[in-house]
């Protein structure tokens, strides 16, 4: 048994449910929106389309005491080969420019969406 | 919020040229499909151009093809219509606007107008 114990644990979650799962964490979140999301707190907006996942969670991981977008600051880190801490700042980012995080969120869902249906898991 | 500011409309006689600008702010423009749009007095709004997020692919209404050119800048936020061999019947208010099929990511900007005339 406790060889084959490894075999039933599960193994790597395949990219394209990581990413089916993630897109349906942010349509929970767009619809389900009341108040204003994380108090209408303003994040770093980003101006490409290479490393987005890093890019999108050095954003959202500068937004603190925001229990509706934790979940998804969790699933981002999946896709993020290295390791994300507040304060980070990336070229992917647009310095002067902040946007609101219902509508980052709302944009990154209609991007990952778009992959999706390109085929891009990754 | 999300704001589109179109500018660079005027008068223009006819063959000649206008560059469109329009500056984008409040959302993240290089995830949208974005295009121009254009209403000439007394008629219908028509689409005039589209152009992917990446600026890869392009649509051109059959009136411009060959004399119109979109294109964008996604580390400015900018959208752009190069216009040349204007006509009169390009006469129009020019929109900037998103071009997503995806409902509720419809945004507009006021308009910018051009008129061709000699």
């Known amino acids: 048994l406790t060889c084959l114990g490894g075999f039933a644990s599960p193994g790597p979650v395949p990219p394209s449910t990581a990413l089916r799962e993630l897109i349906e964490e942010l349509v929970n979140i767009t619809q389900n929106q009341k108040a204003p999301l994380c108090n209408g707190s303003m994040v770093w907006s980003i101006n490409l389309t290479a490393g987005m996942y890093c890019a999108a969670l050095e954003s959202l991981i500068n937004v603190s005491g925001c229990s509706a977008i934790e979940k998804t600051q969790r699933m981002l880190s999946g896709f993020c080969p290295h390791k994300v801490s507040a304060g980070q700042f990336s070229s992917l980012h647009v310095r002067d420019t902040k946007i609101e995080v219902a509508q980052f969120v709302k944009d990154l869902l209609l991007h990952l969406k778009k992959l999706f249906r390109e085929g891009q898991f990754n | 919020g999300v704001q589109l500011l179109e500018s660079g409309g005027g008068l223009v006689q006819p063959g000649g040229s206008l560059r469109l600008s329009c500056a984008a702010s409040?959302?993240?423009?290089?995830?949208?499909?974005m295009g121009w749009a254009r209403q000439a007095p007394g008629k219908g709004l028509e689409w005039v151009s589209k152009i992917g997020d990446k600026g890869g692919k392009t649509y051109y209404a059959d009136s411009v093809k060959g004399r119109f050119t979109i294109s964008r800048d996604n580390s400015k936020n900018t959208l752009y219509l190069q216009m040349n061999s204007l006509r009169a019947e390009d006469t129009a208010v020019y929109y900037c606007?998103?071009?997503?099929?995806?409902?509720?990511?419809?945004?507009w900007g006021q308009g910018t107008l051009v008129t061709v005339s000699s």
């Open positions: 606007a998103t071009a997503e099929d995806e409902p509720g990511y419809d945004y």
């Open positions: 409040g959302f993240i423009f290089a995830w949208y499909d």
